[in-house]
């Protein structure tokens, strides 16, 4: 038994690090293998993480930490009962993929205007809180051209957008991540998708406006 | 519960010996780091010996290095401390105290035990 | 070794006032500091550690903050059951960790 593709982890930087590999052939990861890992200078006893199977020769493993701080390092050794197969380091500082926002919400009480709200995934004593920038998808459920991606670069979770930018009486869904310019990060997951009906149509005059000034094209 | 019980307190001449022990009770003991923390009388703390859990790994600050040892035996759920060529600033209460799952802080500690050095 | 310096070395203060303790090292140490709590005659009782984190148990009027160099703890509103000395650690490297000289908080 041996190891095809190291181990290689990220962190949500929060509570948990999920450590991927994958090995030389089918592999029973929950009963063959072990995922020992320890905070380097920690005196109590490594931590055990059993590896969940990922396809048939792949491996991955959730291992619970303690909040994060930027300085820490682990160790991290893969056995396979008494056999040491791969022995590594991980900084969870320097791997850091962000969890995914939450509770996206399209709000389209105002006629005119779309506003979408979602939650930080972190809690305010987290370092990330207020270190988050964000992307929001876009999509039309009847038309894959109609694609768009909107750069959230404050820290406010949420997004207006005119109702007009979209077209009228057909539906849409969203989505938004997050990452982190500060760690680096890579984008999180994408939130579960909202799905809502574009329902604008133009005043009267404004439509009326637009069409005679159309028209003199 | 976690419970750490400290003994082998007492008094003690300038140059002797001593023996401190800590059963340790309600948790893991063998998955747990250990230490003594001492305080000197109307003194602050100071950390005198660290093991680590399976005993692999001591420590000590310059003031203890070569004159005192920390122990365990994990069998018996037990720390110790041999404390040789004892001083009179070796004064002080004497608690053992777990480290933290997670962290090197201590979360639990004992009620204490008195070491006095004086002729 | 890290030399941790708390201030104030004592505090007057009365039930309900907000108390600030500071604790500052000589170093860098990140987030690996602990705060304890000890009463006359009575161990060490364990409440923040990671600088921030309060150990199970610990009511919410204590909070933890600061990180690389300058930390804090901070009792919001003291209630008589506080009134004790209080002592910062750090837990950053190998272990020669060391406490602060310890703060006491009395009664005005």
């Known amino acids: 038994m041996k190891v095809l593709q190291e181990p290689t982890c990220v962190s949500d930087y929060m509570s948990i690090s999920t450590c991927e590999w994958k090995m030389n052939g089918p592999t029973n990861c929950s009963t063959e293998l072990r995922l020992l890992y320890q905070l380097v200078f920690l005196l109590s006893e490594a931590h055990t993480c059993i590896p969940e199977n990922n396809g048939g020769a792949g491996c991955v493993c959730h291992l619970l930490m303690d909040d994060v701080v930027s300085a820490d390092n682990y160790t991290l050794d893969l056995w396979a009962g008494q056999q040491l197969l791969w022995k590594g380091s991980f900084k969870p500082s320097e791997h850091v993929k962000p969890r995914a926002p939450g509770n996206l919400t399209v709000h389209t009480n105002v006629s005119d205007t779309l506003l979408l709200t979602w939650s930080n995934p972190y809690p305010p004593d987290n370092y990330l809180y207020n270190h988050l920038t964000y992307a929001v998808n876009i999509w039309s459920e009847n038309d894959p051209a109609d694609f768009r991606i909107y750069n959230v670069t404050y820290l406010e979770p949420s997004l207006r957008i005119a109702a007009s930018t979209l077209k009228s009486g057909i539906s849409y869904r969203a989505r938004v991540r997050a990452w982190a310019q500060c760690y680096n990060t890579t984008w999180s997951e994408w939130s579960p998708s909202t799905k809502w009906h574009n329902s604008y149509r133009e005043p009267f005059e404004q439509h009326h406006h637009h069409h005679h000034h159309h028209h003199h094209h | 519960e976690v419970q750490l019980v400290e003994s082998g307190g007492g008094l003690v001449q300038p140059g002797g010996s001593l023996r401190l022990s800590c059963a340790a009770s309600g948790f893991t003991f063998s998955t747990y780091g250990m230490s003594w923390v001492r305080q000197a009388p109307g003194k602050g703390l100071v950390l005198v010996a660290t093991?680590?859990?399976?005993?692999?790994?001591?420590s000590y600050p310059d003031s203890v290095k070569g004159r005192f040892t920390i122990s365990r035996d994990n069998a018996k759920n037990t720390l110790y401390l041999q404390m040789n060529s004892l001083r009179a600033e070796d004064t002080a209460v004497y608690y053992c105290a777990r480290f933290f799952r997670f962290r090197n802080a201590m979360d639990y500690w004992g009620q204490g035990t008195l070491v006095t050095v004086s002729s | 070794d890290i030399q941790m310096t708390q201030s104030p070395s004592s505090l007057s203060a009365s039930v309900g006032d907000r108390v600030t303790i500071t604790c500052r090292t000589s170093e860098n140490i990140y987030s690996y500091l602990a705060w304890y709590q000890q009463k006359p005659g009575k161990a060490p009782k364990f409440l923040v550690y990671?600088?921030?984190t309060l150990a199970e148990g610990v009511p919410s009027r204590f909070s933890g903050s600061g990180s690389g160099t300058d930390f804090t703890l901070t009792i919001s509103s003291l209630q008589p059951e506080d009134f004790a000395t209080y002592y910062c650690q750090h837990y950053y490297g190998p272990p020669t960790w060391t406490f602060g000289q310890g703060t006491k908080v009395e009664i005005k």
């Open positions: 990671n600088a921030k």
């Open positions: 093991i680590n859990s399976n005993g692999g790994s001591t």
